[in-house]
């Protein structure tokens, strides 16, 4: 055996986001054959022993950063990468909004603002359809998201959320949607 | 309560065997991951051998790897150490222990110790 | 040579406060793996103490208290009694070779 052995793919599905009180399962998935798998949830000591996790109902508590490998022989796999599992419901939906309005020429700006009655610092905003938030450091995580030089790409439905930096994984519940239309 | 007896220590001359167990009570024993973790004289803890709830999981440290062969038997509440090759550095306090969990979690700390056994290497 | 790093040594007064610290790095402490802490008194099998970085066993009184920041994290022990001389011992994991890993345990003396 050369070198470490490839590293697994974990995914939540149907989604990272998941309501409280909804079921996502985490399933681990590491080459054909392996059958030895260890998941475990970060920043608190525990792990399970199976590639799959079904949580009936989401809960507060089951919140985080999520991380699997798998044993072969007598080998470690290099650690997947990081899932996020995110509680959604947590808080009260914040109100999302378009500037100068949800209506665009194609070619020109529009800012997409998140605003919440809570005093929190952190957002996120998602486009229906994309499999993740927008992540640009510009955008992430600011009550402001512009949109410079707009196309036809940029059309679709807006849903954010708000949440707070001391708990990034506890996310409220989502705006209701707002549909940008782009025309021209 | 619980409990963790270990047993099977000694003294053993360098390249000698040895066999160390550990009794377990007043818990549901095949539900827990167990490890065994060394002391030599004086020094500080090493963790050894550590062995899934089922006997699959199985991880050595990298200084005893291929000598020692961790085991349980679920039937007999029983973990097991072999030790083959044996090495003056190997001697050490050998102390068995019992890994918390809760619920379908496995927990990667030790809430239960046993009080341990002497195996000295010498010639 | 300890995977974590301890002082080998701390002391105090009855009644004071002592800090024992331990230092790990990124692929332990430092890569989402929690810290905790074992007392070991003279002569004993070493007994969990803090776990989960901050929690108490049911038992052990609140004078014991731990944080984890980064890649260390440490054990505090405030009103310092005779029965506290012991040596302590952090604990985590390693993602390399998923194995547990300890520090080298420190002496904590009660002076007086």
């Known amino acids: 055996q050369s070198g470490p052995l490839p590293k697994p793919s974990l995914q939540a599905l149907p989604s990272s986001l998941v309501p409280l009180e909804k079921p996502v399962t985490l399933r681990c998935q590491g080459p054909p054959g392996v059958d030895l798998y260890r998941l475990e949830k970060l920043s608190s000591s525990r792990y399970q022993d199976q590639a799959v996790l079904f949580i009936p109902a989401m809960k507060r508590s089951l919140a985080g950063r999520y991380r699997c490998s798998y044993q072969n022989g007598s080998l470690w796999s290099l650690p997947s990468d990081q899932l996020e599992l995110v509680a959604t419901g947590v808080f009260a939906k914040p109100s999302l909004s378009a500037q100068p309005g949800p209506a665009v020429s194609s070619g020109g700006d529009v800012t997409l603002q998140c605003q919440t009655r809570y005093g929190f610092d952190q957002f996120a905003l998602y486009k229906e359809g994309d499999p993740a938030p927008y992540k640009n450091p510009e955008r992430w995580y600011r009550a402001s998201f512009p949109i410079i030089t707009v196309t036809a790409a940029h059309s679709g439905t807006y849903r954010c959320y708000s949440f707070s930096s001391r708990d990034p994984y506890l996310w409220s519940a989502p705006s209701d949607p707002l549909e940008l239309v782009v025309t021209g | 309560q619980v409990q963790l007896v270990e047993s099977g220590g000694g003294l053993v001359k360098p390249g000698g065997s040895l066999r160390l167990s550990c009794a377990a009570s007043?818990?549901?024993?095949?539900?827990?991951?167990m490890s065994w973790i060394r002391q030599a004289p004086g020094k500080g803890l090493e963790w050894v051998s550590s062995?899934?709830?089922?006997?699959?999981?199985?991880d050595y440290a990298a200084s005893v790897k291929g000598r020692f062969t961790i085991s349980r038997d679920n039937a007999k509440n029983s973990l097991y150490l072999q030790m083959n090759s044996l090495r003056a550095e190997d001697t050490a306090v050998y102390y068995c222990?019992?890994?918390?969990?809760?619920?379908?979690?496995?927990?990667?700390?030790?809430?239960?110790w046993g009080q341990g056994t002497l195996v000295t290497v010498s010639s | 040579q300890s995977v974590l790093t301890q002082p080998p040594s701390v002391s105090g007064a009855p009644g004071q406060r002592v800090t024992i610290s331990c230092t790990g790095s990124s692929s332990n402490i430092g890569a989402g793996y929690d810290v905790h802490w074992y007392q070991q008194l003279p002569g004993t099998a070493p007994k969990l103490l803090i776990y989960?970085?901050?929690n108490r066993p049911s038992g052990v009184p609140d004078r014991f208290s731990g944080s984890k920041s980064g890649t260390s994290a440490s054990l505090a022990i405030t009103g310092l009694q005779a029965e506290d001389e012991a040596d302590y011992y952090c604990?985590?994991?390693?993602?390399?070779?998923?194995?547990?890993?300890f520090g080298g345990g420190t002496k904590l003396t009660v002076l007086g």
């Open positions: 989960g970085n901050s």
């Open positions: 062995v899934g709830s089922e006997g699959k999981f199985i």
């Open positions: 222990a019992r890994h918390y969990r809760e619920f379908r979690w496995h927990y990667y700390y030790f809430d239960y």
């Open positions: 604990q985590s994991h390693d993602l390399g070779a998923h194995v547990w890993v």
């Open positions: 007043g818990f549901s024993f095949s539900d827990h991951y």
